[in-house]
């Protein structure tokens, strides 16, 4: 699954919430960022995440489409120079400071499983998705396509505005 371009094809600034409308928030603690899943008070401002969309070639041996086997990969950055990373060993989702080009652990395959929700599959560990576990984000193994609609891996994007990249 190689990224076909160095630049994102499009970018959005959005807030991220769970299928059950809990907000994904990011807090700086002891010089590192923690990720929380929580109910926000009525007027509390939602944290925003920059989603950068990249085109990726699907591995041709799995695709009957020849040149057409494209997927969308996303990176998620809640603050400058920090990106969500998949830690496949610990089954955790972490925020790390990175420089471009970003490591593969920062890329997630985008799935629209339902009309109003998305899922993020780890590029480095196919079949493993960002999900919610004990009020935190974690990596969750999904063993069959039927389980892709399981609510704990579904997220809603509330777009706040378009982000003009150059």
């Amino acid at each position: 699954m190689s990224i076909t371009g160095i630049s994102p094809i499009t970018e959005y600034l959005a807030s991220l919430s769970t299928y059950n409308d809990q907000s994904i928030t990011f807090a700086l603690e002891d010089e590192s960022y923690e990720i929380y899943v929580e109910d926000l008070k009525k007027d509390e401002k939602k944290d925003k995440v920059l989603l950068s969309y990249y085109e990726s070639q699907h591995p041709s041996n799995e695709s009957g489409d020849g040149v057409d086997g494209k997927m969308l990969m996303v990176t998620l950055s809640p603050t400058k120079d920090f990106w969500l990373h998949a830690n496949n060993k610990e089954h955790s989702v972490e925020l790390h400071k990175s420089e471009k080009p970003l490591p593969d652990q920062a890329f997630f395959v985008l799935h629209n499983m339902h009309s109003n929700s998305v899922s993020f599959e780890s590029k480095t560990d196919p079949g493993v998705f960002i999900g919610v576990k004990d009020n935190h984000l974690a990596l969750i193994k999904v063993d069959s396509s039927e389980n892709l609609s399981t609510e704990n891996i579904l997220f809603k994007l509330s777009e706040t505005h378009h982000h003009h990249h150059h």
């Epitope: 009957g64 969308l72 396509s145 609609s149």
Partner: antibody, heavy 122, light 107 residues
């Protein structure tokens, strides 16, 4: 190569229903969203709705919510659209389409069927 | 619903000419625009997506540009086969909407 083969032209009476088909080949049918688009004679294009064959999830243009029903048959890689309570306003060419990306819609129409002409007349 | 307005409605040009058509969105859509060509009696075909990305197999004489509310499709050195209707479409968000089209005729 990717191919979307639609059912043939139909003449239907006002008030009746009709179901058209779109048989997909050359790709993994369940992994791509399928959309339907209407083009009235000499007019522009209108998006009706989309369906994800893997889960059956769908998403509609409000204007067509009570007009169109989208279904799929995974065993034959075929998408269907049923139109109900037909009037002369529904006379049009209807296209099934598919996007460029696995798993994700983005509502971009990279592949098109040849279209099904529906004529509503008594 | 975001309205897409195309201009001009039609144009008549000679083979080899350079032509630019416009598409205006009623509100900011970022770069979420696609362009299609529909030749007489045929289904539409995707030319450009995300405002400026040429789709696979589309000749490089087609160029898309713009951001926000104003977009252009330019055809450098128009060919006889480019006689068609051209539609812009807002992508990504539901419901996607199409412009009314620009008809390109070859003199």
């Amino acid at each position: 190569q990717v191919n979307l083969l639609q059912s043939g032209a139909t003449l239907v009476k006002p008030g009746a229903s009709m179901k058209m088909s779109c048989k997909a080949s050359g790709y993994s049918f369940t992994d791509y969203w399928v959309s339907w688009v209407k083009q009235s004679h000499g007019k522009s294009l209108e998006w009706i709705g989309e369906i994800y064959p893997n889960s059956g999830a769908n998403n509609f243009n409000k204007e067509f919510k009570d007009k169109a029903t989208l279904t799929v048959d995974k065993s034959t890689s075929t998408a269907y659209m049923e139109l109900t309570r037909l009037t002369s306003e529904d006379s049009a060419v209807y296209y099934c389409t598919r996007g460029p990306y696995y798993y994700s819609s983005q509502i971009i129409f990279a592949y098109w069927g040849q279209g099904t002409l529906v004529t509503v007349s008594s | 619903i975001i309205v897409m307005t195309q201009s001009p409605k039609s144009m008549s040009i000679s083979v080899g000419d350079r032509v630019t058509m416009n598409c205006k969105a009623s509100q900011n859509v970022g770069n979420n625009i696609a362009w299609y060509r529909q030749k007489p009696g045929q289904s539409p075909e995707l030319l450009i997506y995300y405002a400026s990305n040429r789709y696979t197999g589309v000749p490089d004489r087609f160029t898309g540009g713009g951001y926000g509310t104003d977009f252009t499709l330019t055809i450098n050195s128009v060919q006889a086969e480019d006689a068609a209707f051209y539609y812009c479409q807002r992508i990504y968000n539901s419901p996607p909407t199409f412009g009314g089209g620009t008809k390109v005729e070859i003199k």
